[in-house]
């Protein structure tokens, strides 16, 4: 859960109570037990550009 009074994390990141900052959800592939990864499961991934129409 994000700490009160902090700015919301950008898309593709999630709040880490253990570090008191937003962390990149991409790192959860390598280390899924990080505390912020629970928030990543509920959040959509960062937008990406399609390589085809």
């Amino acid at each position: 859960e994000q700490a009160p009074g902090t700015a919301p994390c950008s898309r593709g990141s999630s709040w880490s109570a253990d570090l008191d900052k937003c962390m990149d959800c991409a790192s959860c592939r390598a280390r899924p037990k990080s505390d912020f990864c629970l928030g990543c499961a509920a959040a959509p991934p960062a937008p990406f550009r399609l390589l085809w129409p």
Partner: antibody, heavy 120, light 108 residues
Framework: EVQLLESGGGLVQPGGSLRLSCAAS????????MMWVRQAPGKGLEWVSY????????HYADSVKGRFTISRDNSKNTLYLQMNSLRAEDTAVYYC?????????????WGQGTLVTVSS | DIQMTQSPSSLSASVGDRVTITCRAS??????LNWYQQKPGKAPKLLIY???SLQSGVPSRFSGSGSGTDFTLTISSLQPEDFATYYC??????????FGQGTKVEIK
């Protein structure tokens, strides 16, 4: 120069309490996670406890859970470890260490340690 | 908890020798592996983080390699000040970080 200086160790009877302190200097203390690690005489390193930069999140090894409490005072640049219900197996040198700014990745600076002896 | 096993537990070597210490994790820890050096009566000192990254100020004769479950710390040419105990530490299974039992490097 980064410095971490532990204090508060000593001889205590089983069941007793001690409060360790770790005074930080040479860096801005508040953004860094901190931890305590201990080393029993002649033995290896054992992680004891972790605290987030704000102090809002804490973690403990199973061996000390419910008996030890980690805290910090960022205005005083100081880390604490309150140790209650001490046992003979808690006898060790206790080190404080500074975490990196990524997730639990490494601990780059350590204090010189303070010896806690639990004995009757 | 993830168990970290170092080998050998001790070794004897001479100045100038190439020394290799291994650390094995009980399950894959990716590259979340650090190495520390500890001299008698002193605090541990970070040597290598993220399996192969040299900590600032550490001599280049120290190097680390490996990923998954098997890791190696190598001292390319042992110096008198390198006689110490070396510990590996995993930071994958947080917050329950664990250390290896240590490898003592002694003078032959």
């Amino acid at each position: 120069e980064v410095q971490l200086l532990e204090s508060g160790g000593g001889l205590v009877q089983p069941g007793g309490s001690l409060r360790l302190s770790c005074a930080a200097s040479g860096f801005t203390f508040s953004p860094y996670p901190m931890m305590w690690v201990r080393q029993a005489p002649g033995k290896g390193l054992e992680w004891v406890s972790y605290i987030s930069p704000s102090g809002g999140s804490t973690h403990y090894a199973d061996s000390v859970k419910g008996r030890f409490t980690i805290s910090r005072d960022n205005s005083k640049n100081t880390l604490y470890l309150q140790m209650n219900s001490l046992r003979a197996e808690d006898t060790a040198v206790y080190y404080c260490a500074r975490g990196g700014d990524t997730y639990f990745d490494y601990f780059d600076y350590w204090g010189q340690g303070t010896l806690v002896t639990v004995s009757s | 908890d993830i168990q970290m096993t170092q080998s050998p537990s001790s070794l004897s070597a001479s100045v100038g020798d190439r020394v290799t210490i291994t650390c094995r994790a009980s399950q894959s820890i990716s590259s979340y592996l650090n190495w520390y050096q500890q001299k008698p009566g002193k605090a541990p000192k970070l040597l290598i983080y993220a399996a192969s990254s040299l900590q600032s100020g550490v001599p280049s004769r120290f190097s680390g390699s490996g990923s998954g479950t098997d890791f190696t710390l190598t001292i390319s040419s042992l110096q008198p000040e390198d006689f110490a105990t070396y510990y590996c530490q995993q930071s994958y299974s947080t917050p329950g970080i664990t250390f290896g039992q240590g490898t003592k490097v002694e003078i032959k």
